[in-house]
């Protein structure tokens, strides 16, 4: 019986182990600045790294310009986006600025698109000094299914930070569906 | 057999216990406010609490201003930096501020310092009012390895916020490395 | 054997499932814009979804304006809170405001109330521009026992945006306490 | 990497006029309260003036009152020296810092209190 004994606690380390890691997903995207669209309306962000510097995926997918989710659970979501510009860039088009996020969740089997998650703000940027800067960050808990879809959208995209520290996104899920 | 499989369940019980405190450090640090360096350029922050207030620490180290992390894994790192002057703590040099935040990872074994996440907005604190008050917040999720540390760099010191509820950064444990 | 084997693996899998269910509270709010006070003044926002839309709970309760606490554990708590201002919304009494939010913790046995986050900005928000918005995030990582209390206090609530992806507030429990 | 760059020094007469100014260039500061300070052959460095972020504010050496003024443009660089009524013993190397701290201290005529120094230009009254 206690050879049994090890033989359950064996298997059951690996199944915990096993399990633990198949039920926590988890993404963080940074941007992808070779393809930031121009503009100053609304736009979705499509291009994002998932595999280099901080950039990370795990039992989810990054396909389309969208982040898919895998496993049905509840996540935590997070964006960090800033937005900046020096006068070397060229002359804004309006000093009256809205710099603002959206992060969207699209159910394919339902097309439809809402946003779970919105910030930022409106800004004067004066000519009176060379440089601008402002960022915005925004998280919550949600439920997600498989198959349903996170992107981000953004307001003046040609505004934004490209580095990997500033621009980025990402989930992890904390906990299943009951 | 009965007796046996409530040993089982016992111990397993213990060992989830166990393994799942073991497997979850996390750390909530408060600016202490007695050591804030002077300057407008940016500075690393080596002064905070750990164990009073809201603060507090485990299964990580605090160590020259450093949080240090003991365990591989994912982690959620977090911080929030309140800026704040009014007319009565004296005159400010510039009224044009940038007010920034950077949660930087250094790696003890390649001596080197990377930044994971930036935030923070460009400030016009024009003497028209006489109070002024800004505050940041960053969030992300990050692949951290035993002995890796995370600090936090500021511009303009001077004027954060020393409240505990204001100025704090932290982490928790998420999930293991694969 | 072989059968007493499955049965313990059996429970097992349906001890850790509950167990885990069990300890993960959460709470996901968003405002009840309907009875959103007046004035400029700092105030306590009492009305909250908890069961519609991006709305959640569970093993947690949401009572009189306060969200409680039914579990000890470290909790991570957020909050969003997004204010705007159209001029076809009438003349700002000031167009210096100070946006601010304050997420506060209140123990019933010592009824004492302190404030763990608070975030927020000095904004002008002038005549020349007919349309203002702004955003505040704060999130970290408290312990919190079970019967206590955390509510949402914000500057000019008169000036919130009450859409459920710009206001809100929440919480998940990430670990048990020692 | 930041650099200050002085320029407008010459040779001019006594009593007569220059005007100098400090430009940054690389990660600029040109919305950062700045200082000029001097130093004549085999001298200390001497300060000669300093200007708020916004120009609102300035503040002058005694030996310089009255007949030295700073100013920044409204829009960012540079941040210019008016010098008037020049002396001999106004003959130096001008250079202009970066001030270093959020807020105006008493120091603010220390050179230790200033960053980011230029090469300098060299000013010469003489007849």
């Known amino acids: 019986i206690r050879a049994e004994k090890a033989m359950v606690d064996g298997s059951w380390l690996d199944l915990a182990k096993r399990s633990k890691l198949e039920a926590q997903p988890f993404a963080h995207l940074t941007i992808n600045a070779t393809d930031i669209p121009s503009g100053s309306h609304k736009v979705s962000l499509s291009s994002w790294y998932h595999d280099r510097g901080w950039a990370k995926i795990s039992n989810m997918t990054f396909s389309n310009g969208k982040l898919i989710v895998n496993q049905d659970g509840f996540y935590y979501l997070y964006a960090n986006i800033c937005f900046r510009h020096h006068e070397t860039s060229g002359d804004l088009a309006t000093e009256y600025l809205q710099l603002m996020v959206y992060v969207t969740k699209t159910s394919i089997k339902i097309p439809s698109s809402h946003t779970l998650m919105k910030g930022g703000s409106t800004k004067y940027w004066s000519g009176n000094s060379e440089f601008h800067f402002y960022s915005i960050n925004v998280g919550g808990f949600f439920k997600l299914r498989s198959g349903e879809e996170i992107s981000i959208e953004v307001s003046n995209p040609s505004l934004l930070d490209p580095d990997q520290d500033a621009t980025y996104f990402g989930a992890f899920k904390v906990r299943d569906i009951d | 057999i009965r007796a046996e499989k409530a040993m089982v369940d016992g111990s397993w019980l213990d060992l989830a216990k166990r393994s799942k405190l073991e497997a979850q450090p996390f750390a909530h640090l408060t600016i202490n406010a007695t050591d804030i360096p002077s300057g407008s350029h940016k500075v690393s922050l080596s002064s905070w609490y750990h164990d009073r207030g809201w603060a507090k620490i485990s299964n990580m180290t605090f160590s020259n201003g450093k949080l240090i992390v003991n365990q591989d894994g994912f982690y959620y790192l977090y911080a929030n930096i309140c800026f704040r002057h009014h007319e009565t703590s004296g005159d400010l040099a510039t009224e044009y501020l940038q007010l920034m935040v950077y949660v930087t990872k250094t790696s003890i074994k390649i001596p080197s310092s990377h930044t994971l996440m930036k935030g923070g907005s460009t400030k016009y604190w024009s003497g028209n009012s006489e109070f002024h008050f800004y505050s940041i917040n960053v969030g992300g999720f990050f692949k951290l390895r035993s002995g890796e540390e995370i600090s936090i760099e500021v511009s303009n010191p001077s004027l954060l916020d020393p409240d505990q509820d204001a100025t704090y950064f932290g982490a928790f444990k998420v999930r293991d490395i694969d | 054997i072989r059968a007493e084997k499955a049965m313990v693996d059996g429970s097992w899998l349906d001890l850790a499932k509950r167990s885990k269910l069990e300890a993960q509270p959460f709470a996901h709010l968003t405002i009840n814009a309907t009875d959103i006070p007046s004035g400029s003044h700092k105030v306590s926002l009492s009305s909250w979804y908890h069961d519609r839309g991006w709305a959640k709970i569970s093993n947690m309760t949401f009572s009189n304006g306060k969200l409680i606490v039914n579990q000890d554990g470290f909790y991570y708590l957020y909050a969003n809170i997004c204010f705007r201002h159209h001029e076809t919304s009438g003349d700002l009494a000031t167009e210096y405001l100070q946006l601010m939010v304050y997420v506060t913790k209140t123990s019933i046995k010592i009824p004492s109330s302190h404030t763990l986050m608070k975030g927020g900005s000095t904004k002008y928000w002038s005549g020349n521009s007919e349309f203002h918005f702004y955003s505040i995030n704060v999130g970290g990582f408290f312990k919190l026992r079970s019967g206590e209390e955390i509510s949402i206090e914000v500057s000019n609530p008169s000036l919130l945006d009450p859409d459920q992806d710009a206001t809100y507030f929440g919480a998940f429990k990430v670990r048990d306490i020692d | 990497e930041v650099q200050l760059v002085e320029s407008g020094g010459g040779l001019v007469q006594p009593g007569g006029s220059l005007r100098l100014s400090c430009a940054a260039s690389?990660?600029?500061?040109?919305?950062?309260?700045m200082g000029w300070f001097r130093q004549a052959p085999g001298k200390g460095r001497e300060f000669v003036g300093f200007?708020?972020?916004?120009?609102?504010?300035?503040y002058y050496g005694e030996s310089v009152k009255g007949r030295f003024t700073i100013s920044r443009d409204n829009a960012q660089n540079p941040v210019y020296l008016q010098m008037n009524s020049l002396r001999p013993e106004d003959t130096a190397v001008y250079y202009c810092?970066?001030?270093?701290?959020?807020?105006?201290?008493?120091?603010?005529?220390?050179?230790?209190?200033?960053?980011?120094w230029g090469q300098g230009t060299l000013v010469t009254v003489s007849s």
């Open positions: 810092g970066v001030y270093r701290r959020t807020y105006i201290s008493s120091t603010y005529s220390e050179s230790s209190e200033y960053d980011y």
């Open positions: 690389g990660r600029t500061f040109s919305r950062s309260a």
């Open positions: 200007i708020t972020g916004s120009g609102g504010t300035t």
